[in-house]
Amino acid sequence: IWELKKDVYVVELDWYPDAPGEMVVLTCDTPEEDGITWTLDQSSEVLGSGKTLTIQVKEFGDAGQYTCHKGGEVLSHSLLLLHKKEDGIWSTDILKDQKEPKNKTFLRCEAKNYSGRFTCWWLTTISTDLTFSVKSSRGSSDPQGVTCGAATLSAERVRGDNKEYEYSVECQEDSACPAAEESLPIEVMVDAVHKLKYENYTSSFFIRDIIKPDPPKNLQLKPLKNSRQVEVSWEYPDTWSTPHSYFSLTFCVQVQGKSKREKKDRVFTDKTSATVICRKNASISVRAQDRYYSSSWSEWASVPCS
Amino acid sequence: RAVPGGSSPAWTQCQQLSQKLCTLAWSAHPLVGHMDLREEGDEETTNDVPHIQCGDGCDPQGLRDNSQFCLQRIHQGLIFYEKLLGSDIFTGEPSLLPDSPVGQLHASLLGLSQLLQPEGHHWETQQIPSLSPSQPWQRLLLRFKILRSLQAFVAVAARVFAHGAATLSP
């Protein structure tokens, strides 16, 4: 058993049929010694008396808010949550496996640049009685500070018969060094509580591996005289790290016909312009990627040929 | 070339070679063998390799003030990785395919380190750690980890040379 926060405790249980459970001793936070009784949740049934209460925690029915009283007055509370371990593996019932980039990916994170700011998100089908708390650091043995905000519900989607809820959080490394080569990964830890079930999820990554630039901005076409060719030009996104001579991007320019089946013409360039042939009803798209490290491409920025 | 007197390196040449190194490091990574072994792990090999850190002067301001600190750090890293790529980790079982980009990568690391340091002048280099793989699966794991870490190192080096070529070239 360990303390999650004041008066909230997590009991770690090996979860299998007829498991013996864990013996837990609760102590009433009071100077009083006599006349103390214990109840669980809203029930008025007295579970025991005395300053301490010993219980065998085996299942969710044994978890909940234990309260000690004296003469009708509440002295203190202890909320017991359960953390299930099945066959040596902690349960992951609350969050959905996003399966990208690999199985058992519950948290996904992205950064728009090297400033040390990043966003993480996760999915669940649970709509009520759900709380999240997020902590983060750079490294784990001698952790350096990363500050995270509160997790918020950022999207709701219908997936078949189910509703899916997306939560996200923004974090910022306290003393980021954008030009350095990271040697210690960022650790993100999410505590999830649903009713009386506790679970924790972690992700470990380097900012360089979660970089995804915003799409190029100001995408423009300039027809070339007496030619089907056009000069496409664009600019670095505002959110990208500066100076651009140091934090350089590379670009992919694509000409795509109206039909998805039509052959796509692609050009790769380090410049912020390119000359392509503009077909009727086609569109021109440009996306960006870090020039020197193959993290994610940005989403496409597009303009119609006409 | 970065010479003892502190004159400038051939920024444009270094830029071109460091960008080639980036490409090679990424093309070598998937080709060192099939790999399901978790690339995480509670102990990181990357603790044993030289990193371009915050105080090494490789940021744009540091390069403007005095690029020598940064260039020395890059040189140290290039020599270190060049030794690793020539070690038993890459030459032992399982054998790399004859056309593996690791050979080219090895040669290019040496090429860039020579551009930075002419004969006769020696910056101190770091000892290569004893990672002591005794099994082929351990060598394979180390190859992946070393190449991942090399990709990060050469990316910073390439940024340094690109910025130098754009802003510090005579």
């Epitope: 040596g88 | 099939h34 072994l37 079982e93 180390l142």
Partner: antibody, heavy 121, light 111 residues
């Protein structure tokens, strides 16, 4: 289908040399390592040695001086030679494929049926 | 050599009940976070069969009532609901250092 089959004498006299051949099919010896493992009657398993994809070998130091493992990739055969046999070497000898280096980390995914060798005069 | 000590030597479990076998290594069998510990099942007159590789990965074709956990020196094989066909001897094996070594085996029977 992956198969490994051991062949060789079932009876060997003390001080003689044992030669066992492992013939494999369904995969190439240039892609997978082969180990030899033995099991005395009613006892646990003992690893004898391995021949890697490139032809290099590692042996159990306890019997290294008596062992040689070689292979012929084109014939898909691996040969174990063990000199100076003794009655304590009586065991079932298995030829075993080591799983893909990058996934299995030294786990042995396919085993031959084994051949029982008795050392007796 | 790395010595692997299995416990218990034998185990009698009722059908449908849980069976747990432990394997302790005399030194860590982890290499940069990868546990080179594997589990095998051997039935009488048959060669061993790979069940679990790298401590916790289920070999293809093996029922998911078998699971493995642990790292460094302490490892566990669990059969969540014992079936009649699970009666066998179970061995752990390490491949972190030469020579590869096996545990002494745990015999699982039906109570």
């Amino acid at each position: 289908e992956v198969t490994l089959k051991e062949s060789g004498p079932v009876l060997v006299k003390p001080t003689e040399t044992l030669t066992l051949t492992c013939t494999v099919s369904g995969f190439s010896l240039t892609s997978y390592a082969i180990s030899w493992i033995r099991q005395p009657p009613g006892k646990a398993l003992e690893w004898l040695g391995v021949i890697w994809t490139g032809g290099g070998t590692n042996y159990n130091s306890g019997i290294k001086s008596r062992l040689t493992i070689s292979k012929d990739n084109s014939k898909s055969q691996v040969v174990l030679t063990m000199t100076n046999m003794d009655p304590v070497d009586t065991a079932t000898y298995y030829c075993v494929r080591e799983g893909d280096y990058g996934s299995y980390a030294g786990a042995m995914d396919y085993w031959g049926q084994g051949t029982t060798v008795t050392v007796s005069s | 050599d790395i010595v692997l000590t299995q416990s218990p030597d034998s185990l009698a479990v009722s059908l449908g009940e849980r069976a747990t076998i432990n394997c302790r290594a005399s030194e860590s069998v982890d290499y940069y976070g990868i546990s080179s510990m594997h589990w095998f099942q051997q039935k009488p007159g048959q060669p061993p069969k790979l069940l679990i590789y790298r401590a916790s990965n289920l070999e293809s074709g093996i029922p998911d009532r078998f699971s493995g956990s642990g790292s460094r020196t302490d490892f566990t094989l669990t059969i969540s609901s014992l079936q009649a066909e699970d009666v066998a001897v179970y061995y752990c094996q390490q491949a972190n250092k030469d020579p590869y070594t096996f545990g002494g085996g745990t015999k699982v029977e039906i109570k």
